[in-house]
Amino acid sequence: CDLPQTHSLGNRRALILLAQMGRISHFSCLKDRHDFGFPEEEFDGHQFQKAQAISVLHEMIQQTFNLFSTEDSSAAWEQSLLEKFSTELYQQLNDLEACVIQEVGVEETPLMNEDSILAVRKYFQRITLYLTEKKYSPCAWEVVRAEIMRSLSFSTNLQKRLRRKD
């Protein structure tokens, strides 16, 4: 499955929108920094077959989409930017879903990366728990925004590696 060129452009647009969403000075939020334990090893792309990598990417985008689709998120961010960001993520999900169906049919590895998907889900559970503990404060959302920018960058790099493999 070849991800369309528009997919990588969508990635870049999503990161730009996320960068624009910042509302308060990052400097005032240093004390709220937190180790979410991003599962970096799931995004290095070396041990994966393509089908596995695509389904991990899908889970990452799906969880990001879910996180920014909550009522608390709507209250935290400027609405038009949030809507554009969600639209970009939704388009990426559609691209990846088409690929997941195609690749799983080719490689027949539907259960091989359950652990990887679980690692991504647990990562987002830690993010949600942090937001809850911090009562969805503006600084907590800034820390999470920075974290998601970092994790989306890892996703983008993994997609670049997948394209190079094609």
Epitope: H26, L30, D35, R150, S153
Partner: antibody, heavy 121, light 107 residues
Framework: EVQLVQSGAEVKKPGESLKISCKGS????????IGWVRQMPGKGLEWMGI????????RYSPSFQGQVTISADKSISTAYLQWSSLKASDTAMYYC??????????????WGQGTLVTVSS | DIQMTQSPSSLSASVGDRVTITCRAS??????LNWYQQKPGKAPKLLIY???SLQSGVPSRFSGSGSGTDFTLTISSLQPEDFATYYC?????????FGQGTKVEIK
């Protein structure tokens, strides 16, 4: 390979202006903040200030507020430290270093090689 | 501003010695503390971040501990290349501040 490369040593007279630079490469320049640190001859490290190159938001240590200006040009991945009127007491080694911002990652993990500024009449 | 106080300001030790440097913050900084090593004419080098996390590439003889206001850097067995000046730095709030440094010299 991540690198912060600073401009060369400067010899200036009191009252002169100066702008030194710190060019980042090998990483996404706007994903990290750039801090500046002063070290006077034979002395310890003093934190001067920091800039977020993504939006040029800047903070200074009270000791350096109004004495220096920190800026950045993200199009060329470069941060700057400048003086409008140097004093002999500005003679020091100046270092830039990158900071991961709000991300949980090592603070000030890469440093420039330092720029020696000498101010003498 | 948060004040950082290191002790001792200098110490003499031999190769193989266990060396301990302490750093005290004027208020709680949680675990937002970094340790740096600096050799003459060189830029500082990050050793430990977040009080106890060893920076990539740093030998395991270096370790950090503490939280709140009191922190420790330990070198379990001093090596010839470890003779340098060590600085702690708080990273919880701006302005970031350094300790005054501890110079580790050869006995």
């Amino acid at each position: 390979e991540v690198q912060l490369v600073q401009s060369g040593a400067e010899v200036k007279k009191p009252g002169e202006s100066l702008k030194i630079s710190c060019k980042g490469s090998g990483y996404s320049f706007t994903s990290y903040w750039i801090g500046w640190v002063r070290q006077m001859p034979g002395k310890g490290l003093e934190w001067m200030g920091i800039i977020d190159p993504s939006d040029s938001d800047t903070r200074y240590s009270p000791s350096f507020q109004g004495q220096v200006t920190i800026s950045a040009d993200k199009s060329i991945s470069t941060a700057y430290l400048q003086w409008s009127s140097l004093k002999a007491s500005d003679t020091a080694m100046y270092y830039c270093a990158r900071h991961p911002g709000l991300n949980w990652a090592p603070d000030f993990d890469y440093w420039g090689q330092g720029t020696l500024v000498t101010v003498s009449s | 501003d948060i004040q950082m106080t290191q002790s001792p300001s200098s110490l003499s030790a031999s190769v193989g010695d266990r060396v301990t440097i302490t750093c005290r913050a004027s208020q709680s900084i949680n675990r937002f503390l970094n340790w740096y090593q600096q050799k003459p004419g060189k830029a500082p080098k990050l050793l430990i971040y977040a009080a106890s996390s060893l920076q990539s590439g740093v030998p395991s003889r270096f370790s950090g501990s503490g939280s709140g206001t009191d922190f420790t850097l330990t070198i379990s067995s001093l090596q010839p290349e470890d003779f340098a000046t060590y600085y702690c730095q708080q990273a919880i709030d701006l302005p970031f501040t350094f300790g005054q440094g501890t110079k580790v010299e050869i006995k």
